[in-house]
């Protein structure tokens, strides 16, 4: 039904999340999410993953730098809010962004391997 | 935040269960009571896969497994013998069980540790 997530996915506040335990490059992560009819995590705010805020892990999220727009963009083309990650202005624009659910972000080489989070909106 | 699904608001759903992911630290007994007051049980672990999932969500939490003393067996909340290995079981002071990064350990029941609650759908 419209309120259920696929097996092995977490349901929270009308969203479904797949939290990987495997480590992949950013591109591999993006393709794996797409293959499950979802996209790499796009955050609305830093308490979106409140339920796992004590996790120590970093996860690839769906943010990459667009040279064309000279801005960090989510996979759906919307721009990163400057309030989400105060340190984003110092990020290396060649890198991809890994996120820790306590609200911090790191820019790391897109070829590095991290866990990843896919997201699907229920409604 | 919108609310969907069959679990209480601010709980998560996973594999036909609802989980309350606590952030506050309590003793084992306080955790038991807190979960009861939420019409649920202190976290129980049914299989390896669930243990792996919960370890991703939270680095450590009480589970609903205890023993009366080091001479007694580990039991679940419904009195059944608990089959999985619990580390540090030879320490007589540690009679309540904790999930800690993909393994189960014994801990002092009076320690303040994060707790999670669960109820099956």
């Amino acid at each position: 039904d419209c309120c259920s997530c696929q097996e092995k996915w977490v349901g929270y506040r009308c969203n479904c999340y797949f939290i990987s335990s495997e480590q992949k490059t950013w591109n591999e992560s993006r393709h794996l999410c797409a293959s499950q009819k979802s996209s790499l995590l796009q955050l609305q705010n830093t308490d979106e993953l409140d339920f796992m805020s004590s996790s120590q892990q970093f996860y690839w999220i769906g943010l990459s730098y667009s040279e064309e727009h000279t801005a960090w963009l989510w996979e759906n083309g919307s721009a990163l809010s400057q309030y989400l990650f105060p340190s984003f202005e110092t990020f290396n624009t060649k890198n991809c962004i890994a996120y820790n659910p306590n609200g911090n972000a790191l820019d790391e080489s897109c070829e590095d391997k991290n866990r990843y989070i896919c997201k699907q909106q229920l409604i | 935040a919108r609310h969907c699904g069959h679990c209480p608001e601010e709980w998560i759903t996973y594999s036909n269960s609802c989980y309350y992911i606590g952030k506050e630290r309590r003793t084992w007994e306080e955790s038991l009571l807190a979960c009861t007051s939420k019409n649920s049980s202190l976290l129980s672990i049914d299989n390896e896969e669930e243990m792996k999932f919960l370890s991703i969500i939270s680095p450590s939490s009480w589970i609903g497994v205890f023993r009366n003393s080091s001479h007694h067996p580990w039991v679940t909340m419904n009195g059944l013998a608990f089959k999985h290995e619990i580390k540090d079981s030879d320490n007589a002071e540690l009679n309540c069980a904790v999930l800690q990064v993909n393994r189960l350990k014994s801990a002092q029941c009076g320690s303040s540790i994060i707790y999670h609650c669960k109820h099956k759908l």
Epitope: Q56, F58, S87, T90, F91, N92, T93, K94, N95, N104, L106, D107, E108, S109 | -
Partner: antibody, heavy 118, light 107 residues
Framework: EVQLQQSGAELVKPGASVKLSCTAS????????MHWVKQRPEQGLEWIGR????????QYDPKFQGKATIPADTSSNTAYLQLSSLTSEDTAVYYC???????????WGQGTLVTVSA | DIQMTQTTSSLSASLGDRVTISCRAS??????LNWYQQKPDGTVKLLIY???RLHSGVPSRFSGSGSGTDYSLTISNLEQEDIATYFC?????????FGGGTKLEIK
């Protein structure tokens, strides 16, 4: 394998300028940021600044603004550090660093000693 | 600028010891804390970034912890090759700044 090969030691007179080089191998400098770090004798490390070689954008610690300039030549995969109006305070080892993440320094060159003396 | 303080400038330990080196920031740096090792010949290596993430190729005897303003680097089983000076560095706010270093010597 990532390597940063820095130019040799320099002995320069007060008031003069110097240009140090850092040639990268094992990666393309256009794909990252290059930083320079200063270490005076028996002292700690100070971040001077960084360049994005792909577009030439630079950022400096304000205390090195006017003293240091960081250019890069992507065709030779080389970053430079130019220091002007040298004084004894500029006597130090200068390290070029490959950033990888923006805020930590993953790989360091061997360092270049600059001695300012009359 | 954020000031980074390593109160212990030198430290003596025996081989096999567990050694902890600490570092304090003048304000909360949200775990953006990195550790470097500088050998006597001047060679510098990144050990740990973002408080506890081990850089590739770094032995697992090195670990980092901390939060807010207080951070530490632990070497669990000191080896001869660990004799060096250790620097912390904050990556929270430009300009990036380093601690003064802690020189580790063998007893």
């Amino acid at each position: 394998e990532v390597q940063l090969q820095q130019s040799g030691a320099e002995l320069v007179k007060p008031g003069a300028s110097v240009k140090l080089s850092c040639t990268a191998s094992g990666f393309n400098i256009k794909d990252t940021y290059m930083h320079w770090v200063k270490q005076r004798p028996e002292q700690g490390l100070e971040w001077i600044g960084r360049i994005d070689p792909a577009n030439g954008n630079t950022q400096y610690d304000p205390k090195f603004q006017g003293k240091a300039t960081i250019p890069a030549d992507t065709s030779s995969n080389t970053a430079y550090l130019q220091l002007s109006s040298l004084t004894s305070e500029d006597t130090a080892v200068y390290y070029c660093v490959y950033g990888r993440g923006s805020a930590w320094f993953a790989f360091w060159g061997q360092g270049t000693l600059v001695t300012v003396s009359a | 600028d954020i000031q980074m303080t390593q109160t212990t400038s030198s430290l003596s330990a025996s081989l096999g010891d567990r050694v902890t080196i600490s570092c304090r920031a003048s304000q909360d740096i949200s775990n953006y804390l990195n550790w470097y090792q500088q050998k006597p010949d001047g060679t510098v290596k990144l050990l740990i970034y973002y408080t506890s993430r081990l850089h590739s190729g770094v032995p697992s005897r090195f670990s980092g912890s901390g939060s807010g303003t207080d951070y530490s680097l632990t070497i669990s089983n000191l080896e001869q090759e660990d004799i060096a000076t250790y620097f912390c560095q904050q990556g929270n706010t430009l300009p990036w700044t380093f601690g003064g270093g802690t020189k580790l010597e063998i007893k």
